[in-house]
């Protein structure tokens, strides 16, 4: 091991204060006691250290806690957190939501980094599930957080946590993720009345099956086109013209503008043209009158 340079006379740090910003890296290494640093971590954030000086301070903490920092230190890391690697964070045991919030606050506005992803992963795994308070915190800092999880990870979200989800939190979710979230939302909101239920469930409908869409069509919900366009194509195809008309209410006129896009395009191809004509929207591409429609998928299932 390289012999350590001695601290120059009169430079030994008695406390963590602003005089340390004028220390060279080797002086910080030689003159700052790691135990003192650990007990005064809350002061570091107030002092304008350079990134290189922070590296020295981090090195001192690493030497003091080779198995990982205690939560009392982690909670006060402040912007020193930005210096941590995923490998460092995997050694931590973060159990307090306050600690998580403090570290996410430091990272606020930054891109979601591997460090933050690791921190969140460690925290959630430690809790065993993504509870409402945690989800509330994470989506407040990262609106896209929920949609960054795999369907398998989403399966650990309890229905009670769904109350913390805002529509914008689901903006980037794909159908596979909504398939997992929708049944949980249905369960979470099941005791709400019709119109209130629809307001809450609307963002999750990209995971709804046909039978639930049929049920909604009987409730005068007036689904907007943006929501309709996010529905699963396979769930929309079996809906009749009358059901779609009831589902959309006054928004049905918007189908014309979307007739070339999925799922509207595929749905039109499955409808009888004379049924489409009843909408009076000029939708074209339905099955001509007099044609017999064979559902080949049903035929295969029977044979």
């Amino acid at each position: 091991e390289v012999e350590k340079t001695a601290c120059p006379s009169g430079k030994k740090a008695r406390e963590i204060d602003e005089s340390l910003i004028f220390y060279k890296k080797w002086e910080l290494e030689a003159c700052v006691d790691a135990a003192l640093l650990a007990t005064q971590m809350d002061r570091v954030n107030a002092i304008p250290f350079t990134y290189e000086q922070l590296d020295v301070l981090k090195h001192k903490l690493d030497e003091l806690y080779p198995q990982g920092y205690p939560e009392s230190v982690i909670q006060h890391l402040g912007y020193l957190f930005l210096k941590m690697s995923p490998e460092d964070i995997r050694k931590w045991n973060v159990t307090s939501l306050e600690t998580l919030k403090a570290l996410l606050e430091v990272n606020k506005g930054h891109e979601m980094s591997p460090q933050v992803a690791t921190l969140i992963d460690r925290f959630v795994k430690g809790r065993g599930q993504l509870d409402k308070d945690t989800l509330d915190t994470l989506t407040a800092f990262y609106p896209g957080y929920l949609c960054s999880l795999s369907p398998e990870e989403l399966s650990s979200v309890p229905p009670s946590s769904i109350w913390a989800v805002r529509p914008q939190d689901l903006d980037t979710c794909d159908p596979r993720q909504l398939d997992v979230l929708y049944p949980k939302a249905r369960l979470a909101f099941q005791n709400m009345n019709g119109s209130e239920y629809f307001v809450k469930i609307q963002s999750f409908l990209g995971g709804a099956p046909t039978e639930d869409l049929k049920a909604l069509s009987q409730q005068n919900v007036s689904m907007d086109l943006a929501t309709f366009m996010k529905l699963r194509t396979d769930a929309v195809l079996p809906l009749t013209v009358a059901e779609v008309q009831k589902l959309l209410g006054p928004h049905v006129e918007g189908l014309k503008a979307e007739e070339r896009h999925r799922p509207v395009r595929d749905w039109i191809l499955r409808q009888r043209q004379d049924d489409l004509d009843t909408l009076g929207l000029g939708l074209q591409g339905g099955i001509p009158n007099g044609y017999l429609v064979l559902d080949l998928s049903m035929q295969e299932a029977l044979s």
Epitope: E18, I21, P48, T50, E52, L54, L82, G109, S113, Q115
Partner: antibody, heavy 117, light 107 residues
């Protein structure tokens, strides 16, 4: 001695794109955080974005978030700023600088970006 | 965002004069403050960091002081090469923000 040299500026139409580069020399580039700052004609300096030494930590000012992308190539001692969906108000001299956390200790000479139809 | 307000926006002075420029932060920033000098057509140059630390190679006639919200840059004896625009910058939080400058002109 430390040197930072920007390039890639020029005239571009609104909605267009440009990629700025900053070539670094005279120091160990991979050890330092880097930043982009701009100055519109007769206006204040505006900090835009920074990237950590490894490239894993990035931050953007709201004015450019979603349109600009900062990146670096440590093997080539280079910093980049990809600018998309450019607007007239993005017209400025763009500087790269070495970021020390509490201050920017070295700056390039700047490259002029003009967004006009 | 933290707003940085410089005053005055310009000052006329003669060689040998003592010049003081102030910078106020909209909220406390401890000593997370730097000062830069910029000459026309040139990049800014770091003078002071940490509110009072003199950057290597910068003449000792430049000094900085202050903490919290109020900061001062002082040029003890103005030299011909000091006529320029001076900017303060906070680094306490993101986004980093600059003052809009104080122009030091020849009287």
């Amino acid at each position: 001695q430390v040197q930072l040299v920007e390039s890639g500026g020029g005239l571009v139409k609104p909605g267009g794109s440009l990629r700025l580069s900053c070539a670094a020399s005279g120091f160990t580039f991979s050890d330092y955080y880097m930043t982009w700052i701009r100055q519109a004609p007769g206006k204040c300096l505006e900090w835009l974005s920074y990237i950590s030494s490894s490239g894993s930590t990035i931050y953007y000012a709201d004015s450019v978030k979603g349109r600009f992308t900062i990146s670096r190539d440590n093997a080539k001692n280079s910093l980049f700023l990809q600018m998309n969906s450019l607007r007239a108000e993005d017209t400025a001299v763009y500087y790269c600088a070495r970021d020390r956390n509490s201050h920017f200790d070295y700056w390039g000479q700047g490259t002029l970006v003009t967004v006009s139809s | 965002d933290i707003q940085m307000t410089q005053s005055p926006s310009s000052v006329s002075a003669s060689v040998g004069d003592r010049v003081t420029i102030t910078c106020r932060a909209s909220q406390g920033i401890n000593t997370w403050l730097a000062w830069y000098q910029q000459k026309p057509g040139k990049a800014p140059k770091l003078l002071i960091y940490g509110a009072s630390g003199l950057q290597s190679g910068v003449p000792s006639r430049f000094s900085g002081s202050g903490s919290g919200t109020d900061f001062t840059l002082t040029i003890s004896s103005l030299q011909p090469e000091d006529f320029a625009t001076y900017y303060c910058q906070q680094a306490k939080s993101f986004p980093r923000t600059f003052g809009c400058g104080t122009k030091v002109e020849i009287k």
